[in-house]
Amino acid sequence: ITQQDLAPQQRAAPQQKRSSPSEGLCPPGHHISEDGRDCISCKYGQDYSTHWNDLLFCLRCTRCDSGEVELSPCTTTRNTVCQCEEGTFREEDSPEMCRKCRTGCPRGMVKVGDCTPWSDIECVHKESRTVAAPSVFIFPPSDEQLKSGTASVVCL
C-alpha cells in the first residue's frame, strides 16, 4: 500500500459541515471530532486535509513567502501552491528558498535555457555544446503521473 491508496471507500466528500466517519475515517476536507463520532469540515482558506484521515485537526494552510507568488489558493482539500517569483528559482537541494537566477552565462558559453521557477538559466560551452553543470528540466506531469505522484525529471 502506498499513499496513492487514498480512501477506504472512494466516495464524494459530503457538503454538510458534519457527517459520520466511515470505518473511523473522515474524507478529504474534514477531520474527526474528539469523540470520534463526527467528521468536521476544514475551514476554507485556513486549513485543509488531502486524504482520508482520523486527524483531530485539519492541517494549517501554507502562506507563500515573500519572493513567492500564489499559484493556487488553499482549499479545504488542497494546500496553497506557491511558486518562485519571476527571475528566481527553487533548487531541489534547498527547497525552502527561492534563489536569484543568473543574469547571463560566463565567457565562452551560450544560453540554451531560460530561468524558470524550477531552474536557473542553462549555459553550454560554445564549441562543444555540452552543459556546464547538471541542469534539470521538469516536464509538466500527465494525469497519470499526478495520480501516482511521479513527474518526469530529465538531467542533462
Epitope: E23, G24, D35, H51, R78
Partner: antibody
Framework: DVKLVESGGGLVKLGGSLKLSCAAS????????MSWVRQTPEKRLELVAA????????HYPDTVKGRFTISRDNAKNTLYLQMSSLKSEDTALYYC??????????????WGQGTLVTVSA | NIVLTQSPASLAVSLGQRATMSCRAS??????????MHWYQQKPGQPPKLLIY???NLESGVPARFSGSGSRTDFTLTIDPVEADDAATYYC?????????FGAGTKLDLK
C-alpha cells in the same frame, strides 16, 4: 489524558508463544487505528502490526507475517498481540501506540511505556 | 522498503546553540503536496514522543524551538536554541509506503 498500558511481556523459549495486551483509556478507542511498535536492544524501531478501528484492515511487515496476530476488543478498550514461533530477533520492548491515519497508517501520536519480551534458547 | 538514513549518528551542541540533524529517504516520500515524514524524540527509559508530523507540522504541546523542513528525499530537524531538556535520541519515520519505517536515530548530547 490518553493512557496506554501494556502487559503480558516476559521470558519465553525459542519457538514459544506469548500474548500481549494493551488497555487504553482517555480516547474513543473504537474510532482509531492502533498498532504495536517494537524497539530492539540496539534501539531500532519497527512497526510490528496495525489494525483499523473495526478490525477490518490489518497491516504486518514481512518479518512477522504468519507468526503474529493483532486483534482488538472495542467493548473492553483493549488491543492484543498474539505472538507465536518466536525467534531470538523478536526480543524487544513492545509498545502499544495510537496510530494516526492520513491516507495510510501514518504517524504514532501516543505511546505506552512498553512491555519487554525476551526470547531465549 | 523505504530506507531512512539519519546523520550524524550523534552530535554535541552547546546550550543555546542550534542543533540540526538530517534524514534521507531512499526514495521520495512526497505526494499531493505532502511530505510523509515524521520526527520523534526519545529520552532514556521513556517511549518515543511525536514532535513533528508531515515534515513540518508541530505536534500540539511541542515547543516552537523544534522545527522540521524538507521535501522529497531530504529532511531536517532543527532545534534552536537547544535547552538542557533536549538531550535525547531523535528518530525520523516515513509513512509514504508500507511498511512504515524508522531511521536509526541521531543522539543529541549537550556540551
Amino acid at each position: 489524558d490518553v493512557k496506554l498500558v501494556e502487559s503480558g511481556g516476559g521470558l519465553v523459549k525459542l519457538g514459544g508463544s506469548l500474548k500481549l495486551s494493551c488497555a487504553a483509556s482517555g480516547l474513543p478507542f473504537n474510532s482509531y487505528y492502533m498498532s504495536w511498535v517494537r524497539q530492539t536492544p540496539e534501539k531500532r524501531l519497527e512497526l510490528v502490526a496495525a489494525i483499523n478501528s473495526n478490525g477490518g484492515r490489518i497491516h504486518y511487515p514481512d518479518t512477522v507475517k504468519g507468526r503474529f496476530t493483532i486483534s482488538r476488543d472495542n467493548a473492553k478498550n483493549t488491543l492484543y498481540l498474539q505472538m507465536s514461533s518466536l525467534k531470538s530477533e523478536d526480543t524487544a520492548l513492545y509498545y502499544c501506540t495510537r496510530l494516526t491515519y492520513y491516507g495510510n497508517p501514518a504517524w504514532f501520536a501516543y505511546w505506552g511505556q512498553g512491555t519487554l519480551v525476551t526470547v531465549s534458547a | 522498503n523505504i530506507v531512512l538514513t539519519q546523520s550524524p549518528a550523534s552530535l554535541a551542541v552547546s546550550l543555546g546553540q542550534r542543533a540540526t540533524m538530517s534524514c534521507r529517504a531512499s526514495e521520495s516520500v512526497d505526494i499531493y503536496g505532502n511530505s510523509f515524514m515524521h520526527w520523534y524524540q526519545q529520552k532514556p527509559g521513556q517511549p518515543p514522543k511525536l514532535l513533528i508530523y508531515l515534515s513540518s507540522n508541530l505536534e500540539s504541546g511541542v515547543p516552537a524551538r523544534f522545527s522540521g523542513s524538507g521535501s522529497r528525499t531530504d529532511f531536517t530537524l532543527t532545534i534552536d536554541p537547544v535547552e538542557a531538556d533536549d538531550a535525547a535520541t531523535y528518530y525520523c519515520q516515513q509513512s509514504y509506503e508500507d511498511p512504515l519505517t524508522f531511521g536509526a536515530g541521531t543522539k543529541l548530547d549537550l556540551k
